[in-house]
């Protein structure tokens, strides 16, 4: 019958001839009376046997993320009858594994968004990278992340990738941030490879700011003949939040003599100071009014922000008319 | 903090006209909101304001004092002036300029006041 | 114009005791438009309340102010020796006109 061992190969051997191992027949008594020969996919080409001794020879280099293992087929022949002296077999040639791939990401460009303010723990993304070496050879495959750019505001599971933070961020200090995340195969010992993806994290806005407004006092003026509904004047606050956590309301705190009002303007976010009621310079010719601000949506979790509504006075100075 | 000094001669003759400025400093004559007056006190007697002005020029007067009062803004000097025609001896007074306050038309800072006397 | 009268033209008190000085109004103005200031001899008046309880900075609590329509009052809870001085009222609604002055004097 046939002997030999398991074939094994390992990839990217730089020799012109690496011997793998030997086929040979039991019957074999080594007087070279046996022809052995090897048949198949990558015989003669990639795989030669020595035809007297039946020893296999690898005479090119391997690469196994190419091509894993190789099935070749036997047969031994006695050269004096020309006669199979074995049935043909067939046998396999394993090529092993070598650490020559690195880890790579495959799914980037990675980009993320989450809230601002967001809890430390919260969970960004998960990336994730592959290495084409094998999985159940050592280590060659085994991959660890760790962050090389994004402290202190995120850190990374060095086993699954994913993104978590870990420090509350303001997108009103910045808005997005660029992490860098290595892969290293090996789970890091000597001899790893590496490979490294970016991820943009964008912050997206929560209201956590209120309206302020631009001046602590505004002076306006108007006419004594102005009728009912006159606009005398707008008054503005500013939010350092985007889209709909900045859109405010304006109201009148405080007006004894109950002549204004003050509409909102919601395309242009002011305050439009209104004459409620006809002026008499005679009667009254300065007013005094206080005006505060408030947001529009705020969600109970963020009414810690906006305890305290942002005021402005308004000084109002009656023009006279002169009366026919 | 604001503080505000007023200059000017101490003795006017009457018929004459009396010139008064009041310099800022601390603080900007521009500040939007805010009107500078110049308000008078005769010896031994009460307090009367006299007209107001906005660093854009706006002036507002006392309806009593209205033709022979003028008050002008120079926002290059921070200063604003004073100048009261056809003086008699009943304008002689302490002259105080002040500005307004923050949350109304009240007199939050107020000069040293300066005397003017009207005498031939 | 707005006419205000303040009395009494002079109130005699001891230190200690509590000052109540009126300022009358001829027409009503808001409650708003009304303050007080305090004028000690030699000196530019100094503003105590606005509108018409709101102290001003840096006065003391025992200065207050009420009021409203056409009358006001400032109380000064406990005098002390350097509240003995001239308080006039002020409105700033139409115009703006002074009281005549009240003198808090010591008995």
């Known amino acids: 019958g046939w002997v030999w061992n398991q074939f094994f190969v390992p990839e990217e051997m730089n020799t012109t001839s690496h011997h793998i191992g030997q086929l040979r027949s039991d019957l074999d008594n080594g007087n070279n009376s046996f022809q052995y020969k090897l048949l198949g996919a990558g015989a003669g080409s990639t795989f030669i046997i020595d035809e007297r001794t039946g020893d296999i020879y690898a005479i090119q280099k391997l690469d196994r993320e190419e091509r894993s293992l190789y099935i070749l087929r036997a047969q031994v022949i006695d050269i004096a009858t020309g006669r199979a002296v074995e049935p043909e077999s067939e046998f396999v040639i394993k090529v092993s594994d070598i650490n020559d791939n690195e880890p790579k990401f495959l799914d980037e460009p990675y980009e993320a968004i989450v809230p601002e303010m967001s809890p430390e723990g919260t969970l960004v993304i998960q990336v994730t990278a592959s290495d084409a070496d094998d999985p159940s050879s050592g280590n060659n495959a085994r991959l660890l992340y760790s962050l090389l750019q994004g402290q202190p505001y995120f850190s990374v599971e060095p086993t699954t990738g994913v993104i978590r933070i870990s420090s509350k961020m303001d997108r009103e200090l910045q808005d997005e941030y660029w992490v860098i995340i290595q892969a290293k195969d090996m789970i890091g010992q000597p001899g790893a490879l590496s490979g490294t993806t970016s991820v943009l994290i964008k912050l997206s806005d929560v209201n956590d700011n209120k309206p302020i407004f631009k001046e602590s006092l505004y002076r306006l003026t108007v006419s004594e003949s102005a009728p009912t509904g006159t606009s005398i004047g707008t008054i503005m606050a500013y939010d350092n939040d985007i889209g709909e956590n900045a859109e405010m309301d304006y109201s009148i705190e405080e007006d004894d003599s109950q002549t204004f009002d003050i509409i909102t303007n919601h395309e242009t976010q002011e305050g439009i100071v209104i004459l409620k009621k006809k002026v008499d310079f005679e009667h009254q010719n300065h007013y005094g009014i206080r005006a505060k601000v408030k947001n529009h949506h705020v969600p109970e979790q963020l009414m810690k922000y906006h305890t305290e509504a942002s005021t402005t006075f308004i000084k109002i100075q009656v023009e006279d008319v002169d009366e026919p | 903090q604001v503080q505000l000094q007023e200059s000017g001669p101490g003795l006017v003759k009457p018929s004459e006209t009396l010139s008064l400025t009041c310099t800022v400093s601390?603080?900007?004559?521009?500040?939007?909101?805010?009107?500078w007056s110049w308000i008078r006190q005769p010896p031994g007697k009460g307090l009367e304001w006299i007209g107001y002005?906005?660093?854009?020029?706006?002036?507002y007067y006392n309806p009593s004092l209205k033709s022979r009062v003028t008050i002008s803004v120079d926002t290059s000097k921070n200063q604003f002036s004073l100048k009261l025609s056809s003086v008699t001896a009943a304008d002689t007074a302490v002259y105080y300029c002040?500005?307004?306050?923050?949350?109304?038309?009240?007199?939050?800072?107020w000069g040293q006041g300066t005397l003017v006397t009207v005498s031939s | 114009e707005i006419v205000l009268t303040q009395s009494p033209g002079t109130l005699s008190l001891s230190p200690g005791e509590r000052a109540t000085l009126s300022c009358r109004a001829s027409?009503?103005?808001?409650?708003?438009?009304l303050a007080w200031y305090q004028q000690k001899p030699g000196q530019a008046p100094r503003l105590l309340i606005y509108?018409?309880?709101s102290r001003a900075t840096g006065i003391p609590d025992r200065f207050s102010g009420s009021g409203s329509g056409t009358d006001f009052t400032l109380t000064i809870s406990r005098l002390e020796p350097e509240d003995f001085t001239v308080y006039y009222c002020?409105?700033?609604?139409?115009?703006?006109?002074f009281g005549p002055g009240t003198k808090v004097d010591i008995k």
């Open positions: 509108g018409p309880s």
């Open positions: 002040a500005r307004d306050g923050s949350s109304g038309w009240y007199f939050q800072y």
């Open positions: 002020q409105q700033y609604g139409s115009s703006f006109t």
């Open positions: 002005i906005y660093y854009t020029g706006s002036a």
């Open positions: 027409q009503s103005i808001s409650s708003s438009y």
């Open positions: 601390g603080g900007s004559i521009s500040s939007s909101g805010y009107y």
